[in-house]
Amino acid sequence: APFDDDDKIVGGYNCEENSVPYQVSLNSGYHFCGGSLINEQWVVSAGHCYKSRIQVRLGEHNIEVLEGNEQFINAAKIIRHPQYDRKTLNNDIMLIKLSSRAVINARVSTISLPTAPPATGTKCLISGWGNTASSGADYPDELQCLDAPVLSQAKCEASYPGKITSNMFCVGFLEGGKDSCQGDSGGPVVCNGQLQGVVSWGDGCAQKNKPGVYTKVYNYVKWIKNTIAANS
């Protein structure tokens, strides 16, 4: 298969240990999605990652080994966006309130919400414990990272005619080979220190002319702030 020579995230690299301190793993007996810590008690993830019971795991690097920096906190509230659409994956965003506050330290810290929409060409960091194979499956134990640019909305819409809403944007490489994949959902896309995207969907992974599609967090800043205020 074409892209198997460099198979991390797909086509990424092993993150330096705890270098993505806002990255969380959502666990229901096993890792199933990622997420981002946005304050001591709240996590942003994808709407399609909804489950009635979730344990949030912070400070993780190797999800199969207890390394000493982890904080495991159960979800107290799980709030999917009211307009989430399962079929189109529009409004694919969710908030999780932790049952206790996370202890903020060098290995567990928050990521800022965006103050402006993502600009075309901006280099972003995508991370997660998702599949590292574009064909087949190879799930890593250690957190994977990928540096990838924001694509123009025109290129995004051309890649997925009729499927891209104003709440979505594309990040990645039209030549294929580098992308997020299954198991990365809900995880962060951070550009210039701000959480611009949430891993959402795509046609396969790392396929030519089929970049990853991400929830545009900027469009939900007001909803996030209002929801946190109403549930504090």
């Epitope: 694919d92 499956a137 299954q182 198991g183 959902s185």
Partner: antibody, heavy 128, light 108 residues
Framework: QVQLVQSGAEVKKPGASVKVSCKAS????????MHWVRQAPGQGLEWMGA????????NYAQKFQGRVTMTRDTSISTAYMELSRLRSDDTAVYYC?????????????????????WGQGTTVTVSS | EIVMTQSPATLSVSPGERATLSCRAS??????LAWYQQKPGQAPRLLIY???TRATGIPARFSGSGSGTEFTLTISSLQSEDFAVYYC??????????FGGGTKVEIK
């Protein structure tokens, strides 16, 4: 309804090749991996490989690398498995099976795969 | 390659009794595990996926549990139609996809 219909039984001589077809109906053919599994008489299930009908990408078990070729014709929703240089121990029932995980507009949650639809099986006998 | 080991190879059970089948993976497969039932002359049939989720149309007497390396298929009260061979299969890391060697459930 969703089904996979395979071609009929084959009798081949050692050294020959066999090509088994698997016609899909009732779903979007390009949207799901198609796998091939074989079962020798009285034995267990053995995975041979898979094809992504959307991209054409293939993955083969090491054991069959160089002898197996998996292809597809999306215009007629059919997958093919060709096995060359046949030996007597290739005598088996060959199955195609659909992975139920959707490949298109696929959310990136950790998907739990499984073969939800199987073909009826094609018996291939290799005998001199 | 992840090796899947099923035990026992044969299980003799009386109708109405409980049957417990085991499947062990040589390394963690998370919850990426499926169970199939196969009767003579038939293609396998999906019973359980995601280690514990019953497939469409599968009776509630079939249940799956476990994650990581240890998995169990339980048939709470065996019916005559349940006597068959059962296979586990991992999807966590492939190629290759690997099956266990099977457990034959026979009438005692």
């Amino acid at each position: 309804q969703v089904q996979l219909v395979q071609s009929g039984a084959e009798v081949k001589k050692p050294g020959a090749s066999v090509k088994v077809s698997c016609k899909a109906s009732g779903y979007t053919f390009e949207g799901h991996y198609m796998h091939w599994v074989r079962q020798a008489p009285g034995q267990g299930l053995e995975w041979m490989g898979a094809i992504n009908p959307y991209s054409g990408q293939t993955n083969y078990a090491q054991k069959f690398q160089g002898r197996v070729t998996m292809t597809r014709d999306t215009s007629i929703s059919t997958a093919y498995m060709e096995l060359s240089r046949l030996r007597s121990d290739d005598t088996a029932v060959y199955y195609c099976a659909r992975d139920f995980v959707l490949l298109l507009r696929q959310s990136r949650i950790l998907h739990e795969s499984a073969f939800d639809i199987w073909g009826q099986g094609t018996t291939v006998t290799v005998s001199s | 390659e992840i090796v899947m080991t099923q035990s026992p190879a044969t299980l003799s059970v009386s109708p109405g009794e409980r049957a417990t089948l085991s499947c062990r993976a040589s390394q963690s497969v998370g919850s990426n595990l499926a169970w199939y039932q196969q009767k003579p002359g038939q293609a396998p049939r999906l019973l359980i996926y995601g280690a514990s989720t019953r497939a469409t149309g599968i009776p509630a007497r079939f249940s799956g549990s476990g994650s990581g390396t240890e998995f169990t298929l339980t048939i709470s009260s065996l019916q005559s139609e349940d006597f068959a061979v059962y296979y586990c299969q991992q999807f966590h890391n492939w190629p290759p996809l690997t099956f266990g060697g099977g457990t034959k459930v026979e009438i005692k």
